[in-house]
Every structure is written in structure tokens, then in C-alpha cells.
């Protein structure tokens, strides 16, 4: 059901301080500027919607141009205890401390907030992503080293006026950027507090949070240019589904990921791919400007609505899904890595996924939010779609029952 | 700008040795293959050896394997021909030249060597 | 080591004439099979690659066709630039081989 009805004041409208506050890209996430301590230190600050730690470099590393340097800033505080976090590839680890925060392009507030400053790590830190820290905006279930430590959302929200919500543009180039073009060019907008109009077309359309830990929701059937996978829908959530937009990739757990490469293959038979581009080890090239969109089929994710027996549907194109590369053989080419991979912990909708779409992170009514993205990369012919309604029955079921682990992801 | 840039060649006794350069930019040198042609004076192309930086894989010609040894430095992007007990039959101009390796398939398939230096002489005589 | 037959070893044609060069393989090389152009005193050009696939900026008078053992490149209208002699190669398989290549003079 869309989401039209009047709200508070502020709720709503225009955050023109906000829009176009992020950079990056897909490969190496969207990044904020912000600051910390006092006198401030800027560093640009990864947005992580599937993690809860705000962690910043706080010691000299080859990938880093710059770092936290807590001795220089005389709010900071030592909390006198150390935090690890291992990821399936790397790990970082650093002490955990607060000082105050502000975002310069967001809401005109400072907020004494928990900081890990990161003091090793391996495999974290990306050469050329220009960022130095992450912002884990999911809940505190999954903050480490335990869920005392409130993330910063949480303290933002507690210590402000800022409504509990917050929504996000992530906008592909679709074509590869270059290391100075990435550092001119918008990447989208985080508006922390509200919605902004000018980010979508068309309608909002929500689905409910399940669980407060990480944005979990609820896939209830899948489509490859209108073909349903007739797969359980209980598959598609094994053993869950989440937003993060941490995460490149449409990740996708085995038997669903099986069943939508063999669908996406047959949709675009017409040219013949070799095995390591389906698994993401091998680029597929064109000749510049001559990439066959056409080819290759639209994939669409049903959610679950707000209402009983009510779903809607967002809709990618190969434009999302297939990710431009740069660094590739040569500027005669466009080369793409298909940007859908097996996961081993569930459905998770990564930047290629929120590239399409504005979304709205809901957190005070516990839903999220997608409506078509206002800078999402299309053709002449198809465009990223949110629509509904459609009637699906227990959806309830859909949902996997998982048992409790602490668990994280970042990039992969 | 694509460029791959030869240098080292010269006149060596026969017998003696010689480490060609090839300096790569403008591409992903990492993920190419680089190749060496030569072409003797007034003769064709004769294919010599070839490295794949991401796999390290390295093949050679029967004519050159045991003398030559080919070799890349991706912090550099750099490959290298070392040329060692040299004879009056590998006189030639010495071409580097790029490939796309297997990493990138094109719709229609693989590419050959799509880029080549300008070459080196390698003059063996005493 | 696979060996690239090519033919004829020169040839002498007029502009607007069509040229065909041929080239065998002595096993098969799937499509792999590049065609290069190369002037006197230059580095080879690709014009072919992929057997049939024209490489970005080479004018479409040039096409390639075959597969397995058996290639064929052709020049639809020759031009006065086109005079050069050209060179097939395998990269099915290393060594990669070239032919002996076809020098293409004015009539």
C-alpha cells in the first residue's frame, strides 16, 4: 500500500542540505563526509545498513590518505575496551571510545556518539574507495562487541530532534568510473530524518521490518522477466533477506541463486556466456556503446506489504545487475561483472539492488520503503519498477525461523 | 591512451645477454596478457613467449626455451624479456604486445593482441 | 606445435579489386585466429580477431571469416593504403603461431 497519508511536519519534502551528500560507487560503496571530535576531524565515513558500528581508522594505513587521530581531539573519551570484528574475508579491531559527530552536508546537529577506532585490520580498507570508516546504521542487536553499544543512528535519534528514519539514494553511473571522476561526481543522497520528493517517481511502497537486527524482510516469489522460479518461498529468505547497502551484490542463497542464473541464462540465449562470468570471475565486454541490454531479462522481487494477503514488486534491469568495471582491457570496451552471487546467509539486497530505487529506512514505524529511483540508469525501453498491489497468501510462512547468531556483513 | 614501450635492445655477442623492457599504460596490465614477437630482418612474425600477470603463467617458443625468461613487475607495469646466451638467429626487431586475457570474454569471444609497441633491435653479432 | 598455412605468399591486385587470403591450420583452432596488417618498418595492426570479429576503428571492407581449420580474410575494395603484407595467427594454442604471411603489392 503506498504511503500518502499526512505525517508530522518535517517528515516530508525537500532536505536540500542533503541531496547529493554521498560519492562512490557500487564496487566500493557510498560514502559521507563527516566529522569527529574537536577541533572536527573530516573523514569520509562508508554507509553500512548491514552492520551497527561506527569504526574509523584511527591509525596509519597504506589505503588510508587520512585517520582519527583521537590525542588531537580533546572530547574524545576512552571507553577502556577493545572490539573485534571478523567478516568472512578480513577483520578490523580497535578500542572503543565516544566524541562527538556531525555530518556537514545533514542534519545541523552534534551528537556525542560510540566510536571504534580502528587500530588493525586486514582486507577492510579498500585501495581507491577514498573512505576511512563505516557507519553501521542496523540495530543494536548486531552492534559488537554486544548490544550495549548503542549505534550511532540510535544515539542521533535519542539526543536530537531528528525523526527516527532514514532514507537512501544510491545512484550507479552506470559506466565505470575513474578514480578523480568518482571524487567529482554525486553518487546520491543519505537524508538522515525524512523523505525527500525529488529522489523517486511514482509511489512509496512499504514492507515490514521482521526483525530489528539487521533490515530483514520477506521476499514472497521471484520473477525473471515475468517467470515465476515456483520456488518455496521460504528458499527465497534462507535464512533471511536484508538491505544492506554495504554489500555490492544481489546475493542469493544456493538453490534460488541455481534457479535464477539457469533462468537468466535461457532469457538471454540468443548470445552464449562462458561459466566464470555467471560466478562472477570473468568480465563479459562489448564494443563501447553496444552492450545488448535487450538481451537480457528484468528481475523482479515480490515483498511482502503492509497489508494481509498484499505484496508489491520491485523490478531491476540488467542495467543494475550488470556492474560496470573499470580498469578493464581498454577504453574501446564496456565490460560488466554480473553482479548477482550465492550466499551462504541469505537473501541480501546490496547496492545493485538499492541502485534502482529511492529506499526508505522507516525505523519508527518498522518498515522499509522502495520507490523507483529518480537517477536510476536505464533505456529507452525498460525502466526500474515498484508496483503493487498483488495478492499473495501466507506470506507469513515465507519468513525462515533463524537461530540466534551474531553475525555482520561488509562489501563482499 | 594505450602504450606499451620497448627498450633494452642493442648489439650483444653471440653468446652473450640482454634484458628487454616493455613498459605498459593505459590498461589493466594485471589482468593482460603480454606477449613477444620478433621479426627477423625481411622475415615474418615469430611468436616468442608470453605472461599472464594474475596467473603468473608463462609459456615460450622450443626455439627460445631454456635461453629466454619472461617476467612482469605489476607495480611497475613492466614486463621483461631476459635474453641470455644469445645467437646470430635471434637478430630481429623485438615487439611487446598486449592481450586481453581469459578475465574478459568479448560477446563474440577472445581477443588477440589488440596493442604492440613500436619494437626494439636486437642486433647478436660478433 | 600447430602450424598456420597461409596463402598465397604475395599477391598483386588493383584498387577496387576484392583480395582473399586464406589460411589453414594444421589442427583445429576453434575461432581463434587473429589477422594482423603490417607496413614496412611498423608494428603489426590487428584488423581480425575471434576469426570474423572487426576490431574497433578497421574499416568494414575487412572481414574474416572460418573456423576449425580453415580461415579466410578478405578485403571487399582494396584501397591504396591496404597495400601491406598481412599475417594470420592461432591463439587457440601455445605457441601461438603465425603464418608466414601474404604480401599484397600493387598491379
Known amino acids: 500500500e503506498t504511503d500518502e497519508e499526512p505525517e508530522e511536519p518535517g517528515r516530508r519534502g525537500s532536505f536540500v542540505e542533503m541531496v547529493d551528500n554521498l560519492r562512490g560507487k557500487s564496487g566500493q560503496g557510498y560514502y559521507v563526509e563527516m566529522t569527529v571530535g574537536s577541533p572536527p576531524q573530516t573523514l569520509n565515513i562508508l554507509v553500512d545498513t548491514g552492520s551497527s558500528n561506527f569504526a574509523v581508522g584511527a591509525a596509519p594505513h597504506p589505503f588510508l590518505h587520512r585517520y582519527y587521530q583521537r590525542q588531537l581531539s580533546s572530547t574524545y573519551r576512552d571507553l577502556r575496551k577493545g572490539v573485534y570484528v571478523p567478516y568472512t574475508q578480513g577483520k578490523w579491531e580497535g578500542e572503543l571510545g565516544t566524541d562527538l559527530v556531525s555530518i556537514p552536508h545533514g542534519p545541523n546537529v552534534t551528537v556525542r556518539a560510540n566510536i571504534a577506532a580502528i587500530t588493525e585490520s586486514d582486507k577492510f580498507f579498500i585501495n581507491g574507495s577514498n573512505w576511512e570508516g563505516i557507519l553501521g546504521l542496523a540495530y543494536a542487536e548486531i552492534a559488537r562487541p554486544d548490544d550495549s553499544l548503542e549505534p550511532f543512528f540510535d544515539s542521533l535519534v535519542k539526543q536530537t530532534h531528528v525523526p527516527n528514519l532514514f532514507s537512501l539514494q544510491l545512484c550507479g553511473a552506470g559506466f565505470p568510473l575513474n578514480q578523480s571522476e568518482v571524487l567529482a561526481s554525486v553518487g546520491g543522497s543519505m537524508i538522515i530524518g525524512g523523505i525527500d520528493h525529488s529522489l523517486y517517481t511514482g509511489s512509496l511502497w512499504y514492507t515490514p521490518i521482521r526483525r530489528e537486527w539487521y533490515y530483514e524482510v520477506i521476499i514472497v516469489r521471484v520473477e525473471i522477466n515475468g517467470q515465476d522460479l515456483k520456488m518455496d518461498c521460504k528458499e527465497y529468505n534462507y535464512d533471511k533477506s536484508i538491505v544492506d547497502s554495504g554489500t555490492t551484490n544481489l546475493r542469493l542463497p544456493k538453490k534460488v541463486f541455481e534457479a535464477a542464473v539457469k533462468s537468466i541464462k535461457a532469457a538471454s540465449s540468443t548470445e552464449k556466456f562462458p561459466d566464470g562470468f555467471w560466478l562472477g570471475e570473468q568480465l563479459v565486454c562489448w564494443q563501447a556503446g553496444t552492450t545488448p541490454w535487450n538481451i537480457f531479462p528484468v528481475i523482479s522481487l515480490y515483498l511482502m506489504g503492509e497489508v494481509t494477503n498484499q505484496s508489491f514488486r520491485i523490478t531491476i534491469l540488467p542495467q543494475q545487475y550488470l556492474r560496470p568495471v573499470e580498469d578493464v582491457a581498454t577504453s574501446q570496451d564496456d565490460c560488466y561483472k554480473f553482479a548477482i552471487s550465492q550466499s551462504s546467509t541469505g537473501t541480501v539486497m546490496g547496492a545493485v539492488i538499492m541502485e534502482g530505487f529511492y529506499v526508505v529506512f522507516d525505523r519508527a514505524r518498522k518498515r522499509i520503503g522502495f520507490a523507483v529511483s529518480a537517477c536510476h540508469v536505464h533505456d529507452e525501453f525498460r525502466t526500474a519498477a515498484v508496483e503493487g498491489p498483488f495478492v499473495t497468501l501466507d506470506m507469513e510462512d515465507c519468513g525462515y525461523n533463524i537461530p540466534q547468531t551474531d553475525e555482520s556483513t561488509l562489501m563482499t | 591512451e594505450v602504450q606499451l614501450v620497448e627498450s633494452g635492445g642493442g648489439l650483444v655477442q653471440p653468446g652473450g645477454s640482454l634484458r628487454l623492457s616493455c613498459a605498459a599504460s593505459g590498461f589493466n596490465f594485471y589482468y593482460s596478457s603480454i606477449h613477444w614477437v620478433r621479426q627477423a630482418p625481411g622475415k615474418g612474425l615469430e611468436w616468442v613467449a608470453s605472461i599472464s600477470p594474475y596467473s603468473g603463467y608463462t609459456s615460450y617458443a622450443d626455439s627460445v626455451k631454456g635461453r629466454f625468461t619472461i617476467s612482469a613487475d605489476t607495480s611497475k607495469n613492466t614486463a621483461y624479456l631476459q635474453m641470455n646466451s644469445l645467437r646470430a638467429e635471434d637478430t630481429a626487431v623485438y615487439y611487446c604486445?598486449?592481450?586481453?586475457?581469459?578475465?574478459?570474454?568479448?560477446?563474440?569471444?577472445?581477443?588477440?593482441?589488440?596493442?604492440w609497441g613500436q619494437g626494439t633491435l636486437v642486433t647478436v653479432s660478433s | 606445435d600447430i602450424q598456420m598455412t597461409q596463402s598465397p605468399s604475395s599477391l598483386s591486385a588493383s584498387v577496387g579489386d576484392r583480395v582473399t587470403i586464406t589460411c589453414r591450420a594444421s589442427q583445429s583452432v576453434s575461432s581463434a585466429v587473429a589477422w594482423y596488417q603490417q607496413k614496412p618498418g611498423k608494428a603489426p595492426k590487428l584488423l581480425i580477431w575471434?576469426?570474423?570479429s572487426l576490431y574497433s576503428g578497421v574499416p568494414s571492407r575487412f572481414s574474416g571469416s572460418g573456423s576449425g581449420t580453415d580461415f579466410t580474410l578478405t578485403i571487399s575494395s582494396l584501397q591504396p593504403e591496404d597495400f601491406a603484407t598481412y599475417y594470420c595467427q592461432q591463439y587457440s594454442y601455445s605457441p601461438f603461431t603465425f603464418g608466414q604471411g601474404t604480401k599484397v603489392e600493387i598491379k
Open positions: 604486445a598486449r592481450q586481453p586475457t581469459h578475465y574478459y570474454y568479448y560477446a563474440k569471444g577472445y581477443k588477440a593482441m589488440d596493442y
Open positions: 575471434w576469426a570474423s
